[in-house]
Interface confidence: low
């Protein structure tokens, strides 16, 4: 990786005991971007695999709420808006870090957490497994 | 929202000069889990709105690397694999939650940044601006 | 000839169960993914559920639950079990084999009342 010089001005957070505790600035640059999926693209209803975004909400977690997508059908839906068999839906999936409250109900105090997120679906060829 | 009792085995990390910062362990739960996109699933591959994954790396950030999708055709691939200018292909975007280091090249110092990446592309029908 | 022919359809009392049958006449139905459609009277036809050649089964909303697909291959047949009827469900119920331009059977009646 890149070594790059620390920094003199930096606070000296280290906890002997905690050795990979560090200090964050909840106050997020680029906050006023928009979190309601739903209201940033219509994507979900014109895709040819639509999908419905779900309301996942968690207190104990940073940030709480989290919109998860569930593909509509099995199938695509084809140039007449019918369901097409031959094609799939599938979630597509990303990795992303969440604040998870540890210990429990702690206004001050998290652990980095890693959730696998749907964020929309597409469509693709199923995968034909052909019989000798 | 959700009003739930402090703990109180919270450790005490209030700042009166910086009151939004928080104590995070970088320990991160459920580590194991597959970081490269790539390894994950084909779907980029077997999309009709195939994509490719960037490589992003930002040592100041916290994940320094981050995959980006960029749709690989303005169309779709229809049933004959030949690109259909009639359906769009276009990337579905998620924000995300990134730790970037403040002040620059601290070890132990973040805040806490929103950015907008694009996980992965599914077929669209365009919307058609009717001329009056 | 190639044809598909639906049967099972009837009259029956709300919360009663009927069963449909498909059979696929002079071609073999293993290869296609199959869907069961409904029309009632003046609306459009929508898609009730859809099975893969795989296996893989999908319901519309409204009769998740209530509503099994399945296949039999060696019978060249697919089969939607219908529990709990409702009035709603009341139509003409449809097979199709393939794309949408594919096979399409002449349809069976399915009434739902009192």
């Known amino acids: 990786g890149i070594t790059i010089p620390r920094n003199p001005g930096c606070p000296n957070s280290e906890d002997k005991n905690f050795p990979r505790t560090v200090m964050v600035n909840l106050n997020i640059h680029n906050r006023n971007t928009n979190t309601n999926p739903k209201r940033s693209s219509d994507y979900y209803n014109r895709s040819t695999s639509p999908w419905n975004l779900h309301r996942n909400e968690d207190p104990e977690r940073y940030p709480s709420v989290i919109w998860e997508a569930k593909c509509r059908h099995l199938g695509c839906i084809n140039a007449d808006g019918n369901v097409d068999y031959h094609m799939n839906s599938v979630p597509i999936q990303q990795e992303i870090l969440v604040l998870r409250r540890e210990p429990p109900h702690c206004p001050n105090s998290f652990r980095l957490e890693k959730i696998l997120v749907s964020v929309g679906c597409t469509c693709v060829t199923p995968i034909v497994h052909h019989v000798a | 929202g959700i009003t739930i009792p402090r703990n109180p085995g919270c450790p005490n990390s209030e700042d009166k000069n910086f009151p939004r910062t928080v104590m995070v362990n970088l320990n991160i739960h459920n580590r194991n889990t597959n970081t490269n996109p790539k390894r994950s699933s084909d779907y980029y591959n077997r999309s009709t709105s195939p994509w490719n994954l960037h490589r992003n790396e930002d040592p100041e950030r916290y994940p320094s690397v981050i995959w980006e999708a960029k749709c690989r055709h303005l169309g779709c691939i229809n049933a004959d694999g030949n690109v259909d200018y009639h359906m769009n292909s276009v990337p579905i975007q998620q924000e995300i939650l990134v730790l970037r280091r403040e002040p620059p090249h601290c070890p132990n110092s973040f805040r806490l940044e929103k950015i907008l990446v694009s996980v992965g592309c599914t077929c669209v029908t365009p919307i058609v601006h009717h001329v009056a | 000839e190639v044809q598909l022919v639906e049967s099972g359809g009837g009259l029956v009392q709300p919360g009663g169960s009927l069963r449909l049958s498909c059979v696929a006449w002079g071609f073999s139905f293993s290869i296609y993914s199959v869907n069961w459609y409904r029309q009632a009277p003046g609306k459009e036809r929508e898609l009730v559920a859809g099975i893969t050649k795989g296996g893989l089964k999908d319901y519309a909303d409204s009769v998740k639950g209530r509503f099994t697909i399945s296949r039999d291959n060696a019978k060249n047949a697919v089969y939607l079990r219908m529990n709990m009827l409702k009035p709603e469900d009341t139509a003409v119920y449809y097979c199709?084999?393939?794309?949408?331009?594919?096979?399409w059977g002449q349809g069976t009646q399915v009434a739902v009342s009192t």
């Open positions: 199709n084999a393939g794309r949408e331009n594919g096979y």
